[in-house]
Interface confidence: medium
């Protein structure tokens, strides 16, 4: 009799789609790295399913993920960061599906923060600045940022600007006068590391002055 009988019908389980995706975050907590995986099908019954990573690890051959509701998560210093790791979905000792992944190619940076916009009356422009924790990191230092802004009334008309620095100048004449704007920023690795866009920073809202109206710092 199958050793997995108490875990439900394994034959039925093998018919399910166990496709999953993962992202890594390097030095997300001091020198600790994290790896987060989740099933692509939100309806997968995750009872008794475990994730395991093997290979390209320091001091150990394999590590098991912790389960946090519907995501699976590891926080560790033990990622070698060279070579591919084998990430498997398991029931007991049986692997249902595996992927070979280089953790340096699935990096998701932390979201930028401290986004602000200052209006310079004399220059007739807006200086956008933000911060990123990656400036202090050893590994994922070089990022491409995506600044997106829109007039608040234009639901889906976002204008995007890509930049590698954390400062951007928007010309007043390119914006509508006396309008409320929403702006936000996200980041993606842009050098040795590859991966995904970070979450968006919290939005910042600012109002453009009316024409010929002198104004200082934006709200």
């Amino acid at each position: 009799e199958s050793g997995y009988a108490q875990n439900g019908d394994l034959e039925d389980a093998e018919l399910d789609d166990y496709s999953f995706s993962c992202y890594s975050q390097l030095e997300v907590n001091g020198s600790q790295h994290s790896l987060t995986c989740a099933f692509e099908d939100p309806d997968v019954n995750t009872t008794n399913l475990e994730f395991e990573i093997c290979g390209a690890l320091v001091e150990v051959k394999c590590l098991n993920f912790r389960k946090l509701q519907e995501i699976y998560f590891i926080e560790t210093k033990k990622f070698l960061l060279i070579g591919k790791s084998n990430i498997c979905v398991k029931v007991g000792e049986k692997s249902l599906t595996c992927k070979k992944i280089d953790l340096t190619t699935i990096v998701k940076p932390e979201a930028p923060f401290d986004l602000s916009v200052i209006y310079r009356e004399g220059a007739n422009d807006f200086v956008v600045t933000f911060n990123t924790s990656h400036l202090q990191k050893k590994y994922v230092k070089v990022l491409m940022h995506d600044v997106a802004y829109r007039q608040e009334k234009d639901e889906n008309k976002w204008t995007h600007v890509n930049l590698s620095s954390t400062k951007l100048t928007l010309l007043q004449r390119k914006l509508q006068p006396a309008a409320m704007y929403e702006i936000k920023v996200r980041s993606i690795p842009d050098h040795y590391f590859k991966g995904f866009w970070s979450e968006w920073s919290p939005s910042y809202y600012f109002r453009t002055p009316e024409i010929n109206n002198s104004s200082g710092e934006m709200d």
Epitope: L80, I82, G83
Partner: antibody, heavy 121, light 109 residues
Framework: EVQLVESGGGLVQPGRSLRLSCAAS????????MHWVRQAPGKGLEWVSG????????GYADSVKGRFTIFRDNAKNSLYLQMNSLRAEDTALYYC??????????????WGQGTTVTVSS | AIQLTQSPSSLSASVGDRVTITCRAS??????LAWYQQKPGKAPKLLIY???SLESGVPSRFSGSGSGTDFTLTISSLQPEDFATYYC???????????FGQGTRLEIK
Amino acid sequence: EVQLVESGGGLVQPGRSLRLSCAASGFTFDDHAMHWVRQAPGKGLEWVSGISWNSRGIGYADSVKGRFTIFRDNAKNSLYLQMNSLRAEDTALYYCAKDEYSRGYYVLDVWGQGTTVTVSS
Amino acid sequence: AIQLTQSPSSLSASVGDRVTITCRASQAISSALAWYQQKPGKAPKLLIYDASSLESGVPSRFSGSGSGTDFTLTISSLQPEDFATYYCQQFNSYPLWITFGQGTRLEIK
């Protein structure tokens, strides 16, 4: 059978160039980082250069930096070392080696038999 | 870069002897160390990885120990085929970098 076969060595004058090749077989080449290690006559092992599976991670020993270039062609299961501005001190037996990071640490578990480079006028 | 210093540089021993070779790192490397054996005219052969894990097919008379900066390779009972040169090796993953010790030549007394 896992195998690495180096070629391209020979006698070359100082300042000239040479390209070494390493043909890999018996394993999934594009899953593994690869290295060049050399050994001068009667001397110890010296790591020369390494390249990650996808060519994005590359390293060189200080003694060859700026003169040697490592590259790979995963479609051809081949590793290369382009050696420019050769010096007498580059004379050595050059080994191609495969990493096996699944061991937990970065170790070289398969080595070729080497190809000899002699730099002399 | 981290330096690895092996000692002794050479030693003479007899069949059946217990032999210890040490490798000292210039800074702590956890257990990121491997040992290789090289016989004249041959390519190096992996013996030990993770400081103490025995490579498949390597006789159990070989063992490794240590962590941090001090590591040892021990051959519990020397066999005639063990006379060779032994190297320790360390790696750094970012940037990619490998360092070898200068080698220890083990000769028949």
